[in-house]
Interface confidence: medium
C-alpha cells in the first residue's frame, strides 16, 4: 500500500492543501485513496511511513510575524484531529519572496478509515511547480 | 533492495551530483547499482522510496538571483528524463556563505533499468563533509 | 520493527537530544527500545531507514558564527561512534529568533545492539512544541 500525490493550486481559502493524481503520482491500489483532493485515507490498520514536502515563497515584510508552518495531521474515525508532525521556517528577506522547502516524515499507526492531510499557515505562498510540493505514505 | 551513497566532490562542470560507495554506504545487492558515479539504477520493477539530502553553502550577493534548487530526476529506458521532486532554498545573507540543508523523498514506480539522479543549480556550493550530502532508495 | 519518539526538553547540558514515548509515539515491539531517553537500540541485524526531524529557533547575533548542525550518529557494540547524517542551517536574522526545520533520513545497516542518537550544536535552541522535533526508524 503506497501513495504519492502532487500539489494542486486551489482557489479555496482553507489552510488544508489540495492534491491530485497527476504527473508522476503513485496510487498502488484501492486500500489507499485520495478523498476530496485533500486527504489520504487508508482501509487497513497498520504502521505507515507518512511524508510531505512543501515548498513555499514568502517575504518577511509582506507576511505575518509568525513563521510559515506546515503540519501533517491525522483524523481517525470517532477521534479528534491531531497533529503528527510540524515544521516551521521563518520568512525570507529576499524580494519579492524567497523560496524555502520543508520536509516532514515519520512512522505512525493508522486505524482503518484514518485520514492524513497537510495544513499550512498560508496556502497562497505554496509553490506548485513540478516536483516542489508532494504528499505520500507507504505501509510497512 | 536498498542503497545509500555518499557525495563526492567533482571537477566536472555538470549539474548532476557525483556519488561514491564510501564511508557508511549501503548497497544491498546487485539489483541496484551506482552507475558512472552519478545514478542509481534498478533491475527490478516496483515501488521505491527514493530520497536525497543536499547541504550547500551560498551567499545572496555572490550567487545568481535564482534560488538553489535540488532536483531528483528519473530516466527510464525509452523515455526522456523527468523531474520527480524538487526543493528550493533562497541563498543566505551570511558571509562568506551560509549553510542550508535540503531533504527530498517520495514513493515512485520504477521500471527495470530505470535510473535516478540528483541535479543542483550550482554543484560548487554543495557541502561534502561527512554526512552532509547523500542519496538513496529502498524497494517497498 | 519500527519506532517514532518525541522530543523532550532537558536540563542536561549534553548535545545529545532527549526523547520520550509520549504523544503519538510508535514502539512496535521489544526489538527496538528507547534507552536512557536518548538512543534507539535495535536487537536485530538488518537494514533500517532511520530519520530525525529537528526544529530550532536561533538568531544570528545571539548565536556563534557556526551554523546550527543536527547529526544522526551510530554507536555499534565495540566500535567508535560515527556520524551517519548531518544537516546544517545558518542562523536566522529574525528577532528574537527565527524558526527553521531540518530533516535527516537514510538507509543503514545496523548490527544487533547498535544504537542511534541525535546530536545538535545547541540543544537550548530546539523547539519542543507538538510535532516539531522527532526521531525514528523502521526495519526494511
Amino acid at each position: 500500500i503506497a501513495a504519492h500525490v502532487i500539489s494542486e493550486a486551489s482557489s479555496k481559502t482553507t489552510s488544508v492543501l489540495q492534491w491530485a493524481e497527476k504527473g508522476y503520482y503513485t496510487m498502488s491500489n484501492n486500500l489507499v485513496t485520495l478523498e476530496n483532493g485533500k486527504q489520504l485515507t487508508v482501509k487497513r490498520q497498520g504502521l505507515y511511513y507518512i511524508y510531505a514536502q512543501v515548498t513555499f515563497c514568502s517575504n518577511r515584510e509582506a507576511s505575518s510575524q509568525a513563521p510559515f508552518i506546515a503540519s501533517l495531521c491525522l483524523k481517525s474515525p470517532g477521534r479528534f484531529e491531531r497533529i503528527l508532525l510540524r515544521a516551521a521556517n521563518t520568512h525570507s528577506s529576499a524580494k519579492p519572496c524567497g523560496q524555502q522547502s520543508i520536509h516532514l516524515g515519520g512512522v505512525f499507526e493508522l486505524q482503518p478509515g484514518a485520514s492524513v492531510f497537510v495544513n499550512v499557515t498560508d496556502p497562497s505562498q505554496v509553490s506548485h511547480g513540478t516536483g516542489f510540493t508532494s504528499f505520500g505514505l507507504l505501509k510497512l | 533492495i536498498a542503497a545509500h551513497v555518499i557525495s563526492e566532490a567533482s571537477s566536472k562542470t555538470t549539474s548532476v551530483l557525483q556519488w561514491a560507495e564510501k564511508g557508511y554506504y549501503t548497497m544491498s545487492n546487485n539489483l541496484v547499482t551506482l552507475e558512472n558515479g552519478k545514478q542509481l539504477t534498478v533491475k527490478r520493477q516496483g515501488l521505491y522510496y527514493i530520497y536525497a539530502q543536499v547541504t550547500f553553502c551560498s551567499n545572496r550577493e555572490a550567487s545568481s538571483q535564482a534560488p538553489f534548487i535540488a532536483s531528483l530526476c528519473l530516466k527510464s529506458p525509452g523515455r526522456f528524463e523527468r523531474i520527480l521532486l524538487r526543493a528550493a532554498n533562497t541563498h543566505s545573507s551570511a558571509k562568506p556563505c551560509g549553510q542550508q540543508s535540503i531533504h527530498l523523498g517520495g514513493v515512485f514506480e520504477l521500471q527495470p533499468g530505470a535510473s535516478v539522479f540528483v541535479n543542483v543549480t550550482d554543484p560548487s556550493q554543495v557541502s561534502h563533509g561527512t554526512g552532509f550530502t547523500s542519496f538513496g532508495l529502498l524497494k517497498l | 520493527i519500527a519506532a517514532h519518539v518525541i522530543s523532550e526538553a532537558s536540563s542536561k547540558t549534553t548535545s545529545v537530544l532527549q526523547w520520550a514515548e509520549k504523544g503519538y509515539y510508535t514502539m512496535s515491539n521489544n526489538l527496538v527500545t528507547l534507552e536512557n531517553g536518548k538512543q534507539l537500540t535495535v536487537k536485530r541485524q538488518g537494514l533500517y531507514y532511520i530519520y530525525a526531524q529537528v526544529t530550532f529557533c536561533s538568531n544570528r547575533e545571539a548565536s556563534s558564527q557556526a551554523p546550527f548542525i543536527a547529526s544522526l550518529c551510530l554507536k555499534s557494540p565495540g566500535r567508535f561512534e560515527r556520524i551517519l547524517l548531518r544537516a546544517a542551517n545558518t542562523h536566522s536574522s529574525a528577532k528574537p529568533c527565527g524558526q527553521q526545520s531540518i530533516h535527516l533520513g537514510g538507509v543503514f545497516e545496523l548490527q544487533p545492539g547498535a544504537s542511534v542518537f541525535v546530536n545538535v550544536t545547541d540543544p537550548s535552541q530546539v523547539s519542543h512544541g507538538t510535532g516539531f522535533t522527532s526521531f525514528g526508524l523502521l526495519k526494511l
Epitope: A9, K22, G23, Y24, Y25, S127, H128, G129, T130, G131 | A66, I69, S71, R79, F80, R82, I83, R86, E109, T121 | -
Partner: nanobody, 116 residues
Framework: EVQLLESGGGLVQPGGSLRLSCAAS????????MAWVRQAPGKGLEWVSS????????YYADSVKGRFTISRDNSKNTLYLQMNSLRAEDTAVYYC?????????WGQGTLVTVSS
C-alpha cells in the same frame, strides 16, 4: 484532449540558428513540465531538453548543452527551443513532449535539416 503542435523547422546551414515553437492545448500548460525530444533518420528517440512548469529549471542533453535554450511562455501556452550553432548531427524530427506517469504525449513533430 492534449494537443501539441510544433512549428519552426526547416533547412538551415551548419552554424545557423532556428527557433522551434510548440503550441499546447487541452491541459493546464502552466502546471506541467515540458520537454523536447528528437529522432534522427534511422535512429531512436533522443531526449534533448526539459523545463519545469515555472520555467526556472532547465535541463539539457550533453550533445546540445551551450547551443540550445529551452523556454516557455505560460501566458501563451507555448514552449520554445532556440537552436544555435547547428550541426549536421542535429538533423532530426523534433517533437514537443509532455511527460505523464505511464506514457509521454508528443506532437506530430517538425523537421530540422542541417546541411550545406
Amino acid at each position: 484532449e492534449v494537443q501539441l503542435l510544433e512549428s519552426g523547422g526547416g533547412l538551415v546551414q551548419p552554424g545557423g540558428s532556428l527557433r522551434l515553437s510548440c503550441a499546447a492545448s487541452g491541459f493546464t500548460f502552466a502546471l506541467y513540465q515540458m520537454a523536447w525530444v528528437r529522432q534522427a533518420p534511422g535512429k531512436g528517440l533522443e531526449w534533448v531538453s526539459s523545463i519545469d512548469s515555472s520555467g526556472s529549471d532547465t535541463y539539457y542533453a550533453d550533445s546540445v548543452k551551450g547551443r540550445f535554450t529551452i523556454s516557455r511562455d505560460n501566458s501563451k501556452n507555448t514552449l520554445y527551443l532556440q537552436m544555435n550553432s547547428l550541426r549536421a548531427e542535429d538533423t532530426a524530427v523534433y517533437y514537443c513532449a509532455k511527460p505523464e506517469r505511464d506514457f509521454d504525449y508528443w506532437g506530430q513533430g517538425t523537421l530540422v535539416t542541417v546541411s550545406s
